[in-house]
């Protein structure tokens, strides 16, 4: 995945007060023991800082060393800082762990911008605000890096939650979640609620706040409203899905649906933006510009470079359109749509104007590696990564930021024909997916 574009990722805390939750629809799926219900100990276990990532607390080694680890569904390595670095407050000290085992193998992960490299080993790992289990997992001890760690982000490593196919150095290195499921009774499923603040947070606010929840092994009803709608995981490498239609304020972009998935579409908590293939991005921006034409914004804003600032509390949300992505459903010829608001795709940025201004970056950007449904999308929804049933579920997040006029939505079913034709078949090569 493109590190230079993927990270830093944004988070944000808070969102709509509970009193603004939508009424729950009643057509729920039947309960599945051990997989749905209440996971109180895991709720609110994520924190983060705007633009710099959602992280969970983990412990590594014996005695346990506590580290904050970025939650990343767009990669498959568990990698932690293991040497001093100017941006790290702490790091994994293998020599202090009696349970560390060296695999005597190196790993090198280059990105478009930056890289990390390290030494492979295994150790005992647990998640304090997760399931009450300890697993022996592969760990990449990062000894050298460039443009990977982020100053002030407060995380010291990355938890790649995708599949073994994209693990480095190769697919024989078992990812953390696979190890967890194999070694324990934790069901093969996790769910994420990323809560965007809708306003920038300073460092002290972030450290004192909640950024969302990673529910390991289940689904928590309190984190979403309405129904969960599922889309198939097309292939188990990234969390690849198929988009069948895109609308801006209800207006179809009318593109060949293959364009939406060229060369893939993935759900990636380690990416800040909604990233779209070049042709799709250009069409979407043209449509968003037309919808918001009562104002004109500079080209640099649409490129994600310039920030537009409004007087605090006067952001004209109403002039910006909603964006709907239709995803392939579980039933033949059936799709559903997820709809995000400008509150998701305009990203609040701190420290640039006065405290009397609210400044935002446009958080939709161009991609050469397909569609990436990053935090911009995920902050609107509770997202269930149901690996056991090879599907991803979406429901409206109980913490998404909205206003009194519009809310994010997950709606269906819609009749959509020939959805299989929307997938793009990538020619098989030996090239690194990380370098594309």
């Amino acid at each position: 995945t493109q590190h230079g574009i993927r990270l830093p990722l944004r988070s944000g805390l808070g969102g709509a007060p509970l009193g603004l939750r939508l009424p729950r629809e009643t057509d729920e799926e039947p309960e599945e023991p051990g997989r749905r219900g209440s996971f109180v100990e895991m709720v609110d276990n994520l924190r983060g800082k705007s633009g710099q990532g959602y992280y969970v607390e983990m412990t590594v080694g014996s005695p346990p060393q506590t580290l904050n680890i970025l939650v990343d569904t767009g990669s498959s390595n568990f990698a932690v800082g293991a040497a001093p670095h100017p941006f790290l407050h702490r790091y994994y000290q293998r020599q202090l762990s009696s349970t560390y085992r060296d695999l005597r193998k190196g790993v090198y992960v280059p990105y478009t911008q930056g890289k990390w490299e390290g030494e492979l080993g295994t150790d005992l790992v647990s998640i304090p605000h997760g399931p009450n289990v300890t697993v022996r997992a592969n760990i990449a001890a990062i000894t050298e890096s460039d443009k990977f760690f982020i100053n002030g982000s407060n995380w010291e490593g990355i938890l790649g939650l995708a599949y073994a196919e994209i693990a480095r150095p190769d697919d024989s290195l078992e990812p953390f979640f696979d190890s967890l499921v194999k070694q324990t009774h934790v069901p093969n499923l996790f769910s994420l609620q990323l809560c965007g603040a809708g306003f920038p947070l300073n460092q002290s606010e972030v450290l004192a706040s909640v950024g969302g929840s990673m529910i390991i092994g289940g689904i928590d009803h309190s984190l979403y409203t309405g129904s969960l709608w599922y889309t198939p995981i097309r292939r188990e490498w990234y969390y690849e899905v198929i988009i069948v239609r895109v609308e801006i304020n209800g207006q179809d972009l009318k593109m060949d649906c293959k364009e939406y998935n060229y060369d893939k579409s993935i759900v990636d908590s380690g990416t800040t933006n909604l990233r779209l293939p070049k042709k799709v991005f250009e069409a979407a921006v043209k449509s968003i510009k037309a919808a918001s034409s009562t104002e004109k914004f500079p080209d640099g804003f649409w490129l994600g470079e310039q920030l537009v600032c409004w007087q605090a509390g006067t952001t004209p949300w109403n002039i910006f359109p909603v964006i709907s992505l239709y995803l392939m459903g579980e039933v033949t010829n059936q799709s559903f749509r997820i709809t995000i608001l400008p509150q998701q795709y305009l990203r609040p940025v701190e420290d640039v104007a006065t405290s009397q201004d609210d400044c935002y970056k446009f958080a939709i950007s161009q991609s050469s590696t397909g569609t990436v449904m990053g935090a911009v999308i995920m902050e609107g929804f509770y997202v269930v990564f149901d690996r056991a049933r090879k599907r991803i579920g979406f429901a409206v997040s109980a913490c998404h930021v909205h206003d009194e006029f519009r809310t994010a939505a997950v709606e269906g079913p819609f009749v959509t024909l020939d959805m299989e034709d929307c997938g793009y078949n990538i020619p098989q090569t030996d090239e690194s997916t990380l370098m594309t």
């Epitope: 104002e295 004109k296 640099g300 470079e305 310039q306 920030l307 537009v308 600032c309 640039v352 201004d357």
Partner: antibody, heavy 120, light 108 residues
Framework: QLQLQESGPGLVKPSETLSLTCTVS??????????WSWIRQPPGKGLEWIGS???????YYNPSLKSRVTISVDTSKNQFSLKLSSVTAADTAVYYC????????????WGRGTLVTVSS | EIVLTQSPATLSLSPGERATLSCRAS??????LAWYQQKPGQAPRLLIY???NRATGIPARFSGSGSGTDFTLTISSLEPEDFAVYYC??????????FGGGTKVEIK
């Protein structure tokens, strides 16, 4: 070619409202995708942005002045105006109107400016 | 808030000499920076936009460079009409709003 010209009283009493108009000639406000701005410069000091307006009427104001500033546009007269209420001696300055051009990022065309003195 | 600091406050030079003016931003403004010239009793005039592009009608002796936080306006050989006050302005935060405090280029 496009030209901007400020007009309005050169003397305003304290606590009153300063009113200035900028007339655009050589082109139409309503046809062009520019923002139109007011900037001031106290005697011997630097430049201070007051605010900007688009042809649709959408305004942006300097946070330090926003409670006292109103900028409006009259496309039929090809003019935009500034009102600054409750003025004090600190509002004495040369007031410029300007066009935001070059990708709507910079002030590429300016009026000649008009000195407004606040004094009783 | 992004603050633009210009230095020196005053630059005393003779005609024909090279003038180097600095503008430093408190945080990155990418290349969204302009330079203006203001002569006594006149309105400012746009010289350079996007850090290094000369505005229409500006002589080639004026050049701009830099990106991020450090920017330079260079006048390769001062002409008598170049003695004036020069301001920088950023627009990474939009609409454009923030000016530097100015550098006065005076005859030595």
């Amino acid at each position: 070619q496009l030209q901007l010209q400020e007009s309005g009283p050169g003397l305003v009493k304290p606590s009153e409202t300063l009113s200035l108009t900028c007339t655009v000639s050589g082109g139409s406000i309503s046809w062009s995708s520019y923002y139109w701005s007011w900037i001031r410069q106290p005697p011997g000091k630097g430049l201070e942005w007051i605010g900007s307006i688009y042809r649709s009427g959408r305004t942006y104001y300097n946070p330090s002045l926003k409670s006292r500033v109103t900028i409006s546009v009259d496309t039929s007269k090809n003019q935009f105006s500034l009102k600054l209420s409750s003025v004090t001696a600190a509002d004495t300055a040369v007031y410029y109107c300007a066009r935001v051009g070059h990708g709507i990022n910079y002030f590429d065309l300016w009026g000649r400016g008009t000195l407004v003195t606040v004094s009783s | 808030e992004i603050v633009l600091t210009q230095s020196p406050a005053t630059l005393s030079l003779s005609p024909g000499e090279r003038a180097t003016l600095s503008c430093r931003a408190s945080q990155s403004v990418s290349s969204y920076l302009a330079w203006y010239q203001q002569k006594p009793g006149q309105a400012p005039r746009l010289l350079i936009y996007d850090a290094s592009n000369r505005a229409t009608g500006i002589p080639a002796r004026f050049s701009g460079s830099g990106s991020g936080t450090d920017f330079t306006l260079t006048i390769s050989s001062l002409e008598p009409e170049d003695f004036a006050v020069y301001y920088c302005q950023q627009s990474i935060t939009w609409p454009p709003r923030t000016f530097g405090g100015g550098t006065k280029v005076e005859i030595k």
